[in-house]
Amino acid sequence: SGTTNTVAAYNLTWKSTNFKTILEWEPKPINQVYTVQISTKSGDWKSKCFYTADTECDLTDEIVKDVKQTYLARVFSYPAGHVESTGSTEEPPYENSPEFTPYLETNLGQPTIQSFEQVGTKVNVTVQDEWTLVRRNDTFLSLRDVFGKDLIYTLYYWKSSSSGKKTAKTNTNEFLIDVDKGENYCFSVQAVIPSRRTANRKSTDSPVECMGHEKGESRETGHHHHHH
């Protein structure tokens, strides 16, 4: 038969950050190719990445149609010379992925501090709202648009001259914190979805940004904007 020498895919794994979602699997193909299918629990199978020699398939376009649905994918293995007209009636070997619910399982991407501004003993720190590939009508939505108040940010801040960190939390993208006069501070933020109970509750920390660096001096009486 046409599928005798093909092996089923294995180690099917979802890799997803801010809803950019790729299914990966093994093995690297030798004389075989793969086709991926994806469906919701109640939907029909849709084929993607037809007869590919890759071991990954970008399924973002499918999952962003409804990020709160649960999806299942499967990977079919075909002989490398396979074309649809071969007439083989035997079902090719395939393997199912774990279920995947994007809203609950996509990883939070590393956030970025957009700006900070000091006025006297207050500093306003703003976190950049990341764009996702989720759409409403023809408009791309931001991370905040999708997660709303499910998403919070944690700010870690410390005096440049010491290592003792303080924290603040916000369910917006802004922090207003008290600082000591005449001291320079460093900042890092982390995105968090508190209602998650798994390892993907938190993003990695943002790059550290410090006051008083060459992009502009903070002035106790003035404003300091730090933009990427």
Partner: antibody, heavy 120, light 113 residues
Framework: EVQLVQSGSELKKPGASVKVSCKAS????????IEWVKQRPGQGLEWMGD????????NYNENFKGRATFSADTSVSTAYLQISSLKAEDTAVYYC?????????????WGQGTLVTVSS | DIQMTQSPSSLSASVGDRVTITCQSS????????????LTWYQQKPGKAPKLLIY???TRESGVPSRFSGSGSGTDFTLTISSLQPEDFATYYC?????????FGQGTKLEIK
Amino acid sequence: EVQLVQSGSELKKPGASVKVSCKASGYTFITYWIEWVKQRPGQGLEWMGDILPYSGSTNYNENFKGRATFSADTSVSTAYLQISSLKAEDTAVYYCARSGYYGNSGFAYWGQGTLVTVSS
Amino acid sequence: DIQMTQSPSSLSASVGDRVTITCQSSQSLLSSGNQKNYLTWYQQKPGKAPKLLIYWASTRESGVPSRFSGSGSGTDFTLTISSLQPEDFATYYCQNDYTYPLTFGQGTKLEIK
């Protein structure tokens, strides 16, 4: 079609407890917050709190902390509101509602309401 | 907690009228991250559950007639019904959907003149 179907009316004595159920269908139950809203006769709407069935994570309005408890059974797609030590002022219609698809986009679907009457 | 204040508390109008209901929040409902206002409007008829009309201050929920529109930003918001229909006589509520605890306005009862 998204539906939230609540349990029937209840008549309870002061000091008793009541458990209201809200059976969801037509959507992925675990990914949407279930909201609970109280409406006393002839009065406005009061948000009690919410629960995310996926994790059991809850938020409570301080006015209801202690006597109201939210729970969810994902195997039967049902959320529950339990109120203990009932008082006359707990007489109200209790609604469950489902959060919208987008972040902070309101309560898109509502149950029909459950009337709880507390009277001796 | 964010307080929501609606005005007027009640309002009499006729079919075909243009009606405006206002809602004021004690704190800004504008999200700095995405520049959206998390203010929601509902309609409720006697003996029925509320119905979502508008979210994000100005986005009409699917299936809601175009005569309903929402506007405003920060702390001041408006629900406008451009030409009242018989089925629009009901009570309208605004809601803070920005931060916990979520809070409703006291309601505006729209009655037939």
